[in-house]
Interface confidence: low
């Protein structure tokens, strides 16, 4: 019967940062130079021997001689309680497959880690521990004095735990969060009643959970130097230098070489002229808890990032053409270059691809004339298209064209004794139709009946009108736009020796916010299209005159501006175009966008002031000038007399008072005659206008005291 | 190294406003908060409000509600209490004070005496 | 708003020890840290201990400071000439508008 191996010369050491038990044995009587195979299972006791917090079996191939170590991580701080270790063996081994049973344990091994040494009555465990946000972790606190009650916080919030002896309570925080990276302040005080008998605390250095490294991507523009580039995540470093931010390390499995990275979110890697075209690259973070790594496997050549495109010029720029050329940094030979390039002006955006091998060269067709344009180029390497360079760019400006269209021409004519008086105005040309910066009008009047005769009148820009005196004659008068490369198409119109003033009736219309819709009688004989043109009521004709050119198909139109102000009153006129372009005038139109109430109220005098009536007048009033059409008056009148007189009816004024009020339904009725009156009667009167938007503003009334019947004003 | 440099004395009428000033250098400004206390000539210490610099937001003690507006400038690091509607009891050393996440003021200012007198 | 009470003044012989109380409530003492404030004549105050018992650097370990329920104490043990101060307590007060709040303050002269 074989002798069981017992394990002996068990010694049990410590390490308060992890927190561990280390054991170290050795097996007597095993048969020299023979390998067994065996089971140790291992008890661990805390405060007491019978109190077994732990058992566990360890399995190892044992020697002769040899040495045996195992360890054991506690969840609580070793300072916090005394543990006790004892271990037994069983032989576990094919060579002696008879029944095999277990040894006697070994004696028990008392482990103390004492901390707790000087005068203080209190102490906290564990001192400056690290750990991961999201464990858990367990904390005691042992007193010397068991009569004294020990709180103790977390951050301030009280904890509870539970008691181990009379001396030590440990808690368990579970999942503990991150706070600060100056770590997480737990307390405990010992009080006897009321009386602080002493207060410790420790620090608990809680850090952020490493991150896997993110967008971990590499490129070269060189062929000679690889950028690799990420997205390093939380920093995890803690303060008192308890932990440094994470280190990043590349490591290339193909080469085998590893680098460890200065930067937190870039590294550079150089690239070896061995020919090497693939590379696997992992990145490892690493902290004082964990390590995270991602990987990357590429092909160099399919990871070129081209440094921007220089040298960008613009050849044979003319009105509409222009060639657009750039160099790129050649990288290797026979790379074949693919380029964008984007094309900016006038609001719109073109874009065209090209492919180039070392110097890049494109068309850049239909373009306007005088325009601003702003070219840039991108390039990528066209066979494996990683991603594009950066933009390199250039404005450039196309040169003049002659203007490509006729000014839109429009006139007032106005007859004096002998002459006409044409007042010539044309809308400066769109940028557009322009090709350039217009210089001069050329405006060419030609006699009709007299062929022979024409005067030329050169008309420096910006302007835009002229006036022209002319006989009783029928005249044509064309105007050309003229910039520095030529002259547009004239724009003709034809001014009749007749009088066109003929009498046409004016139409009241009534605008909206949208401005004013307007229709009218087609014109009998052939039309080549109609004119409405417009101005301010109140204004000289030549402040605001604007005008709108209509088809021969159309009579009715909208006028819509933002230049229509509520309360301005505007006149339409319409004409005809005959195909000879001589102007008929056919309809007259006025009103306002937007009606608003009266801004003022007539001067009102009193007349012929008796003992019975008084007549009030307002002549000089004019309601011409007024925002709104004036469709009337409303008469206050206030006395003593409880009704009202016949033909005023009773009101209620803004500030709540009554009164009387009469109503003129006729704008150009100026007078009233107020009687049936008492003599030596006290009155007040207030007169103003209304329109459709509402009366005038609110005024003081005037006082009028009727004379005795015997007087005589 | 970490200083609070406030601006200099004020001489005040009742029923005006005063502003005082408070340069903060040495650390990085947006990452403590600041905080306004005063005494009162031969009295304690009476705290007024707090502004976080990062976002600007604020508390007041509500004896001062209405009256005080306390500001920031992060590109100067500078912080500012404006008290309106001055009374003579508003006479007292102003104090800018660094907090800490421990509700401790660390760094104080040297102080600004605003007198209010008719 | 309510301060915190502190004895108006406290003295000691050089070497001695003395202690300062400060008494509160349970929304402010009760239920938050306490720091202490050192205030030389003529000067801005000074973080003398906070978080109930902490010093901040460059803080003498004579000075020390301890919390119980709704009181706090300072203790100056080994009294210096360079002790003679106001001190204050203060904490926040977790009351309906929640404000910092200062003891009365306590002259401490050294005889």
């Known amino acids: 019967e074989r002798l069981p191996l017992t394990p002996v010369s068990l010694k049990v050491s410590t390490n308060s940062t992890r927190q561990s038990l280390h054991l170290q044995w050795t097996v007597h009587n095993l048969p020299y130079h023979q390998e067994l195979k065996m089971v140790f299972q291992i008890q661990i006791s805390r405060i007491e021997t019978s109190n077994v917090i732990w058992v566990g079996n360890y399995s190892t191939t044992v020697k002769w001689n040899q040495v045996l170590h195992w360890s054991w991580e506690s969840e609580l701080p070793l300072e916090c309680a005394t543990h006790f270790v004892r271990i037994k063996s069983l032989v576990d081994d094919a060579k002696f497959p008879e029944p095999n049973f277990w040894s006697n344990w070994s004696s028990w091994e008392e482990v103390s880690v004492q901390d707790s040494t000087g005068q203080d009555i209190l102490f906290v465990f564990p001192k400056d521990k690290l750990v991961e946000e999201g464990t858990n972790v367990t904390i005691c606190y042992v007193s010397r004095n068991i009569q004294n009650n020990v709180s103790c916080y977390l951050e301030g919030k009280q904890i509870h735990g539970e008691q181990l002896d009379p001396h030590v309570t440990a808690f368990n925080l579970n999942s503990v969060p991150f706070i600060r990276n100056k770590g997480t302040n737990i307390y405990c005080e010992a009080s006897q009643g009321n009386v602080s008998e002493g207060m410790k605390g420790i620090v608990l250095f809680v850090s952020k959970v490493l991150e896997e490294p993110k967008d971990f991507s590499c490129e070269t523009e060189d062929f000679k130097t690889l950028h690799c580039t990420w997205d390093p995540g939380t920093d995890t470093a803690l303060g008192w230098s308890k932990q440094p931010s994470q280190s990043y390390t590349l490591f290339e499995s193909f080469s085998g070489e590893k680098k460890l990275c200065t930067h937190k979110n870039w590294c550079n890697w150089q690239i070896t002229q061995d020919s090497q075209e693939t590379y696997n690259f992992t990145l490892i973070a690493e902290n004082y808890l964990r390590k995270r790594s991602v990987n990357i496997l590429f092909n160099l050549t399919h990871r070129v990032y081209l440094m921007n495109p220089f040298s960008v010029n613009f050849e044979n720029v003319n009105a509409t053409n222009a060639i657009m050329t750039w160099k790129v940094h050649s990288i290797r030979n026979n790379f074949t270059y693919l380029c964008q390039i984007e094309l900016h002006g006038e609001g719109k955006m073109m874009q065209y691809n090209v492919s180039i091998k070392v110097n890049g060269e494109y068309f850049l067709s239909e373009l306007e004339p005088a325009t601003e344009y702003m070219a840039r180029v991108r390039c990528a390497d066209a066979s494996h298209f990683w991603k594009w360079s950066e933009w390199s760019g250039q404005n450039f400006t196309t040169l003049e064209a002659a203007p490509s269209e006729a000014p839109d021409v429009w006139r007032i004519v106005s007859l004096e004794p002998g002459n006409h008086t044409v007042t010539l105005f044309w809308k400066p040309l769109s940028k557009l139709h322009a090709n350039g910066k217009i210089l001069f009008y050329n405006v060419v009047v030609e006699n009709l009946d007299k062929p022979s005769s024409s005067e030329l009148h050169s008309i420096p820009a910006p302007a835009n009108s002229t006036k022209l005196i002319l006989d009783r004659c029928s005249y044509q008068i064309c105007v050309i736009a003229n910039n520095s490369v030529g002259a547009s198409p004239a724009s003709v119109i034809v001014i009749s020796a007749d009088p066109e003033n003929k009498e046409v009736e004016e139409e009241r219309i009534a605008g909206t916010e949208g401005g004013f819709s307007l229709s009218w009688k087609p014109q009998p004989g052939d039309v080549i299209g109609y004119v409405v043109d417009w101005c301010d009521h109140t204004q000289d004709v030549l402040g605001d005159f604007q005008w709108k050119n209509v088809g021969p198909n159309t009579t009715s139109t909208v006028i819509s501006t933002d230049a229509f102000r509520p309360g301005v009153r505007y006149d339409f006129r319409i004409y005809g175009l005959s195909t000879k372009r001589i102007a008929c005038l056919l309809e007259k139109k006025t009103g306002y966008s937007q009606e608003l109430a009266p801004s003022d109220n007539p001067h009102v005098l009193v007349d012929t002031l008796t003992s019975h009536s008084f007549t009030l007048s307002w002549k000089d009033y004019s309601t011409e000038s007024q925002p709104g059409f004036i469709q009337g008056y409303h008469v206050y009148l206030k006395s003593k007399a409880r009704q009202c007189h016949p033909r005023f009816e009773k009101a209620v004024l803004s500030d709540g008072s009554e009164c009387c009020k009469y109503k003129i339904d006729n704008p150009e009725e100026k007078a009233l005659i107020v009687d049936n009156l008492k003599p030596e009667s006290f009155y007040e009167f207030f007169i103003t206008p209304f329109t459709s938007a509402g009366e005038g503003p609110s005024a003081t009334f005037t006082k009028v005291t009727t004379p005795d019947e015997h007087s005589s004003m | 190294q970490v200083q609070l440099v406030q601006s200099g004395a004020e001489v005040k009428k009742p029923g005006a406003s005063v502003k005082v000033s408070c340069k903060a250098s040495?650390?990085?400004?947006?990452?403590?908060?600041m905080h306004w206390v005063r005494q009162a000539p031969g009295q304690g210490l009476e705290w007024m409000g707090i502004?976080?610099?990062?976002?600007?937001?604020?508390s007041y003690a509500q004896k001062f509600q209405g009256r005080v507006t306390m500001t920031r400038d992060t590109s100067t690091s500078t912080v500012y209490m404006e008290l309106s509607s001055l009374r003579s009891e508003d006479t007292a050393v102003y104090y800018c004070?660094?907090?800490?996440?421990?509700?401790?003021?660390?760094?104080w200012g040297q102080g600004t005496t605003v007198s209010v007198s008719s | 708003q309510s301060a915190l009470t502190q004895p108006p003044s406290a003295s000691g012989t050089p070497g001695q020890r003395v202690t300062i109380s400060c008494s509160g409530s349970?929304?402010?003492?009760?239920?938050?840290?306490v720091n202490w404030y050192q205030q030389l004549p003529g000067t801005a105050p000074k973080l003398l201990i906070y978080?109930?018992?902490q010093r901040p650097s460059g803080v003498p370990d004579r000075f020390s400071g301890s919390k119980s329920g709704t009181s706090a104490s300072l203790a100056i043990s080994g009294l210096q000439s360079e002790d003679e101060a106001d001190y204050y307590c203060?904490?926040?007060?977790?009351?309906?508008?929640?404000?910092?709040?200062f003891g009365t303050g306590t002259k401490v002269t050294v005889l």
């Open positions: 502004i976080n610099p990062s976002g600007g937001s604020t």
């Open positions: 349970s929304s402010n003492i009760g239920s938050n840290t």
């Open positions: 978080s109930n018992n």
């Open positions: 203060a904490a926040w007060d977790d009351s309906l508008n929640g404000l910092y709040v």
């Open positions: 004070a660094r907090g800490t996440t421990y509700d401790a003021f660390d760094i």
């Open positions: 040495g650390y990085t400004f947006t990452s403590y908060y």
